[in-house]
């Protein structure tokens, strides 16, 4: 049904789902503190550029009751129960911020009369993509995907000059909810890494990936996976691992790895790590500053959907230009804007734009370093360290299948 | 060790002025968006002002606007309040916190206007 939006007369709401069910288990607190941060910042930047006008938010609960997984697998009818609740206390902002599951946030964009924009932390998976009046604000599966398929045909880097097509995808179950749409996305025989691969198969037993490590007949040297260190620990533990196994772990949202006195333990010598650049300084090869704030990312996402708001709140009332309308439920794409730790660009499909880093493990320093940084903007890979201490032979990442190339 | 320490409060009559210090350690200073907090007797925590990391942006409530003025050096690892036309109602424990959620805070400095 058509609700009423809280969005005229120089008062500007924003509805704000506050989900039991979440991609992160960030307490509830934590993201009430990052949307108040960021009412007080679009504010003073609206009250600077002359525009006085009033912006709240309202924090939208859900009652907990039946949806109490905690997780995302129960979240596809919390997020429409909210909805709902919206509905019947006719409170319907003129953005809606929330819900980070992938699950609901495709629900609730299938079930309802979109006139509105939708500002999610998380959607990671494939189905939300190309979604016309939805943003997501953490780098959703397309991006890592596209990443991979370009890291895949390199061949031209003094490190690697191989093209790959080949790959193990492990994925046992028990992933994050962002590691789950990333995997998914890999597994999925009708997408973009599928199809640019000869072989790709998935490794669903601990004892199938272990195996692989020093099986002889292998179809592929390249395991990809998502976690943590300790995650892969637990599973490779001290198993000897042959010398032309490279293993990729995507760890998106994790900035240890840049962290003073942080040594890489011997179990990460065969892995590249990938992470998300931490923000607003330049990479260098090596650390020995620290980069890096604490790990934040799921609150930061809902902190710059408010400061997204402010930017596109601002634009429009400069212009003269209605709020309630489909021109700015679209409009929340293809821009850049100031976001807490500095510029955030969106693409054309309203998604967030981000430098991707690909670490190794340095034999000399026993340090992660970085190897090059991936531009998901401009589809480009930047080579950064053109003489890696890898612990491949040759300093040279070993060709995708065994028997060619460096062994 | 991670800390914020802040300095410069005192006694002050009505009309003067006082600059707060907050120095910064162990962490990296030029990387968060600082906030200066204020405390009156009996009451509840209040903003003054709000500064991004390289300075680029400041903010402050209206009750402060045109009388306080925040500033930082990320050199110095320092972020300073600077305060005007100070009024009896200005009376409080002022305290400097880093990042949104403000997740680490001084030990506070206080500062008392009154003849």
């Known amino acids: 049904s058509q609700v009423s939006q809280n969005c005229h007369n120089g008062s500007y709401e924003i509805s704000v789902l506050m989900m039991g069910n979440s991609a992160f288990a960030e307490p509830l607190k934590n993201l009430e503190d990052a949307v108040n941060e960021g009412l007080e910042i679009v504010r003073g930047r609206l009250q600077n550029a002359g525009l006085n006008v009033t912006v709240n938010a309202t924090f939208m609960y859900s009652d907990g009751l039946i949806h109490n997984s905690g997780d995302c697998r129960s979240s596809t009818c919390e997020g429409l129960d909210l909805l709902r609740k919206i509905s019947n206390a006719q409170r319907m902002g003129c953005v809606l911020i929330g819900p980070s599951c992938t699950y609901s946030t495709f629900q609730m964009y299938l079930d309802t009369e979109l006139s509105y924009p939708m500002i999610s932390a998380g959607s990671f998976g494939l189905s939300c993509d190309y979604k016309e009046t939805l943003t997501r604000l953490m780098s959703p599966a397309r991006k890592l995907m596209y990443f991979l398929v370009n890291f895949w045909k390199t061949n031209d880097l003094p490190f690697k000059t191989y093209s790959w097509s080949t790959s193990y995808v492990y994925k046992n179950g028990t992933e994050t909810e962002d590691c789950f749409w990333y995997l998914n996305a890999l597994e999925a025989s009708v997408s973009y890494f599928s199809h640019e691969l000869g072989f790709k198969v998935v490794l669903r037993q601990d004892k199938e990936f272990q195996d692989i490590l020093m099986d002889h007949n292998r179809k592929s040297n390249v395991i990809i996976m998502c976690g943590g260190p300790e995650f892969l620990y637990k599973l490779k533990g001290d198993r000897a691992v042959a010398e032309d196994i490279v293993i990729i772990l995507v760890d998106l949202f994790n900035d240890q790895y840049f962290e003073d006195n942080v040594t890489a333990p011997d179990y990460m010598k065969n892995v590249l790590v990938l992470t998300l650049s931490p923000g607003n300084s330049l990479l260098n090869s090596s650390f020995s500053r620290n980069l890096s704030p604490t790990k934040r990312d799921f609150a930061l996402a809902y902190l710059n959907g408010i400061l997204l708001f402010g930017h596109m709140l601002k634009i429009f009332l400069e212009n003269g230009e209605n709020i309630t309308t489909p021109k700015f439920a679209h409009a929340f794409r293809n821009l850049t804007f100031e976001g807490y730790d500095g510029p955030v660009t969106l693409d054309d499909w309203g998604d967030v734009d981000s430098t991707m880093v690909l670490l190794y493990t340095s034999v000399d320093t026993k340090k992660y370093k970085v190897l090059l940084t991936y531009d998901t903007h401009v589809n480009k890979t930047y080579p950064v360290d053109m003489s890696p201490t890898f612990t491949w032979k040759n300093s040279k990442l070993p060709n995708d299948i065994t028997g060619r190339g460096p062994q | 060790e991670v800390q914020l320490v802040e300095s410069g409060g005192g006694l002050v009559q009505p009309g003067g002025s006082l600059r707060l210090t907050c120095a910064a350690s162990?962490?990296?200073?030029?990387?968060?968006?600082m906030t200066w907090v204020r405390q009156a007797p009996g009451k509840g925590l209040e903003w003054v002002a709000k500064?991004?990391?390289?300075?680029?942006?400041?903010y402050y409530p209206d009750s402060v606007k045109g009388r306080f003025t925040v500033s930082r050096d990320n050199a110095k690892n320092s972020l300073y309040l600077q305060m005007d036309n100070l009024r009896a109602e200005d009376t409080a424990m002022y305290y400097c916190?880093?990042?949104?959620?403000?997740?680490?805070w001084g030990q506070g400095t206080l500062v008392t206007v009154s003849s």
């Open positions: 916190t880093r990042d949104y959620n403000k997740d680490l």
């Open positions: 162990g962490f990296t200073f030029s990387r968060y968006w």
């Open positions: 500064i991004r990391h390289d300075g680029g942006e400041k």
